[in-house]
Interface confidence: medium
């Protein structure tokens, strides 16, 4: 159906409350170093015209397509030379170039610094006192620390942020209330934040059909009993909801995903027993529900895979007669069997499966040549099994900080050129994979571990991007989606580096270090191992146990001391001489 | 679940010729790799033609090749099977059975097709 004004359709569609607060995500996400009312008084003159254009749909303007919109909005920001620099030359542009231009704009580490909350009656006073603006911080807050959050979801997180202040702000001990509710939110924000930008990525650097691949592999998995017919057409609609959400294009996006989960309700008999209690709740908490949603049971009657693609005598005919049918096919029927497996590990079975079949069907006797595809791919399922139960096993030895360290190291030796935060910040969560996953039963620690690692990888290719320092890193970044994790696993010790200058001022610590919380103490005793790295990469790990365990004493000797600074300047240098002849 | 009605079978006499035709409900056939298998009396069900589900890949048992053709009609949700030049050894019970989810591939075997028709019989006889 046609529309005459685009932007009323998506008010309509969305609603007033919902529009507004996507179009605040989306000029938040553009403009990150913008102030708050500045955001908010876009939106509301943009929802305001909306609202305009959905009582009267021939009204001046309302013709004009969301980019054109959103665009000119965007480029009547006064201080856009000042804060963006060459971001202002996009509005030089004609759409869709412009927008093309602000996306490249968009930076995936601002450097804001983190989110704190005030005092909790400070919070609750603020958020009875104007809930929906309260709200809008949130929104904007994230969206310009996160500018490829999935928008529809931020909402989603809105909602729940609000449902906590609702409930703590009643509650005798505010503080004990939400402390741990926000911290747990917190937490699936930014695991949200970085699974969107790995989507983003996918579609960005390898294309729909990466993206689609991947989709296939994981809804297989989830909705096994659901037929390949039904996986295509829920994996198309996805494509379509991640591709316009990556692309800024938020209320298509948001009214794309409730169009898919009301489609995924009116069709769940043929997609999954597991949808019933998703599709009872409003749209937000319903998408959300059905992206959550638990696996499906496998049903009982599933024939060899061996008969269809190893057995079947059409098999070069189907392959060379549709690829990506054929292979798609055979991506659908092996997750469904193997919900163990993690989808980077299915994408790459797919993969041998292809390239197997590139290789025989060349051949003289396809058939012999093929018998035997199914045998080789132990090595392929080994390697991650092997991985995961490795440092697992590390894991449960040193705690997370320990293994988090061993990361670090590890990490560092294998790309010393990469940047000192960026190292810490991504050792830091491929350590918490340890936390997240090796608790979990064997069934589920894979697919757990190596697709959690993808992302966390995802995080570092994006940085490393903005500005790149090592060629191993953007080779293994941009050779393979599905091998990132295995590329990154297969580094050894980079020899060709040379070390860095000893530099004092990186090893001085103050007395600030001992009021800081235990998370932020962590970081700045991996920012001085992974200097330390830097300067003496041959370090043996038992020196290096060693040198660390020496700086734990000292931080905690001098924060019990009484006058710590005189402490930290006087044991500082000591620490810094010990530990340099320690590691001749 | 696929429920398949099959039709059109009958007497021909030899070089003669019939079509059959499969009409399906509960799915789209475009999205089911189907199948038209026979069986004589006192032999197992025999792979006679394909059309896979999504793109028309079409298979052909050697015995009926350049003689049938199958094809499909999405907008009225039936498979057809257009038999020239029988023979009295095309004389058997015509099924057609369907394999959701397998868009793309249609098996010779017929242990794989969940779902099948009850047959219509064709006699090929002068």
């Known amino acids: 159906e046609a529309y005459k004004s685009e932007i009323a359709h998506r008010y309509n569609d969305l609603g007033e409350e919902h529009f507004r607060g996507l179009v605040l995500v989306a000029f938040s996400q553009y403009l990150q170093q913008c102030p708050f009312e500045d955001h908010v008084k876009l939106a509301k003159e943009v929802t305001e015209f909306a609202k305009a254009c959905a009582a009267e749909e021939s009204g001046a303007n309302c013709d004009k397509s969301l980019h054109t919109l959103f665009g000119d909005k965007l480029c009547t920001v006064a201080s856009l030379r000042d804060k963006y620099g060459d971001m202002a030359d996009c509005c030089e542009k004609q759409e869709p170039d412009r927008n093309e231009c602000f996306l490249a704009h968009k930076d995936d580490n601002p450097g804001f610094p983190p989110l704190v909350a005030p005092e909790p009656d400070a919070l609750c006073a603020a958020f009875q006192d104007n809930e929906q603006l309260f709200l809008g911080k949130y929104l904007y807050e994230i969206a310009r620390r996160h500018p490829y959050f999935y928008a529809p979801e931020l909402l989603y997180y809105a909602q729940q942020y609000k449902g906590v202040f609702a409930e703590c702000c009643q509650a005798a001990d505010k503080a004990a209330c939400l402390g741990p509710k926000i911290e747990a939110l917190r937490e699936k924000v930014l695991l949200s934040s970085a699974k969107e930008r790995f989507k983003c990525a996918s579609l960005q650097k390898f294309g729909d059909r990466a993206f689609k691949a991947w989709s296939v592999a994981r809804l297989s998995q989830r909705f096994p009993k659901a037929d390949f017919a039904e996986i295509s057409k829920v994996v198309t609609d996805l494509t379509k909801v991640h591709k316009e959400c990556c692309h800024g294009d938020l209320l298509e996006c948001a009214d794309d995903r409730a169009d898919l989960a009301k489609y995924m309700c009116e069709n769940q008999d043929s997609i999954s027993t597991k949808l019933k209690e998703c599709c009872d709740k409003p749209v937000l908490e319903k998408s959300q529900c059905l992206a959550e949603v638990e696996r499906d049971e496998l049903p009982g009657d599933l024939p060899s895979l061996a008969a269809d693609f190893v057995e079947d005598k059409e098999v070069c005919k189907n392959y060379q007669e549709a690829k990506d049918v054929f292979l798609g096919t055979f991506l659908y029927e092996y997750a469904r069997r193997h919900p163990e497996y993690s989808v980077s590990l299915l994408l790459r079975l797919a993969k041998e499966y292809e390239a197997t079949l590139e290789k025989c069907c060349a051949t003289d006797d396809p058939p012999t040549c093929y018998a035997k595809v199914l045998d080789e791919f132990k090595p392929l399922v080994d390697e991650p099994q092997n991985l995961v139960k490795t440092n697992c096993e590390l894991f449960e030895k040193l705690g997370e900080y320990g293994f988090q360290n061993a990361l670090l190291v590890r990490y560092t030796k294998k790309a010393p050129q990469v940047s000192t935060p960026t190292l810490v910040e991504v050792s830091r969560k491929l350590g918490k994979v340890g936390t997240k996953c090796c608790k979990k039963p064997e069934s589920e620690r894979m697919s757990c571990a190596e697709d959690f690692l993808s992302v966390v990888l995802n995080r570092l290719c994006v940085l490393h991007e903005k500005t790149p320092v090592s060629e191993r890193v953007t080779k293994c970044c941009s050779e393979s989606l599905v091998n990132r994790r295995p590329c990154f696993s297969g580094l050894e010790v980079d020899e060709t580096y040379v070390p860095k200058e000893f530099n004092a001022e990186t090893f001085t610590f103050h007395a600030d270090l001992c009021t800081l919380p235990e998370a932020e103490k962590q970081v700045k005793k991996q920012t001085a191992l992974v200097e330390l790295l830097k300067h003496k990469p041959k370090a043996t790990d038992e020196q290096l146990k060693t040198v660390m365990g020496d700086f734990g004493a000292f931080v905690e000797k001098c924060c019990a001391a009484e006058n710590k600074e005189g402490c930290f300047s006087e044991e500082g240098p000591k620490l810094v001489a010990a530990a340099q002849a320690a590691l001749v | 679940e696929v429920q398949l009605l099959e039709s059109g079978g009958g007497l021909v006499q030899p070089g003669g010729s019939l079509r059959l035709s499969c009409a399906a409900s509960?799915?789209?056939?475009?999205?089911?790799?189907v199948a038209w298998f026979r069986q004589a009396p006192g032999k197992g069900r025999e792979f006679v033609a394909g059309i896979g589900g999504g793109v028309d890949i079409t298979y052909y048992a050697d015995s009926v090749k350049g003689r049938f053709t199958i094809s499909r009609d999405n907008s009225k949700n039936t498979l057809y099977l257009q038999m020239n030049s029988l023979r009295p050894e095309d004389t058997a019970v015509y099924y057609c059975g369907a394999r959701p989810g397998r868009p793309l591939i249609t098996s010779k075997v017929a242990d794989l097709y969940p779902y099948w028709g009850q047959g219509t019989l064709v006699t090929v006889s002068s």
């Open positions: 509960g799915r789209y056939i475009d999205e089911t790799a």
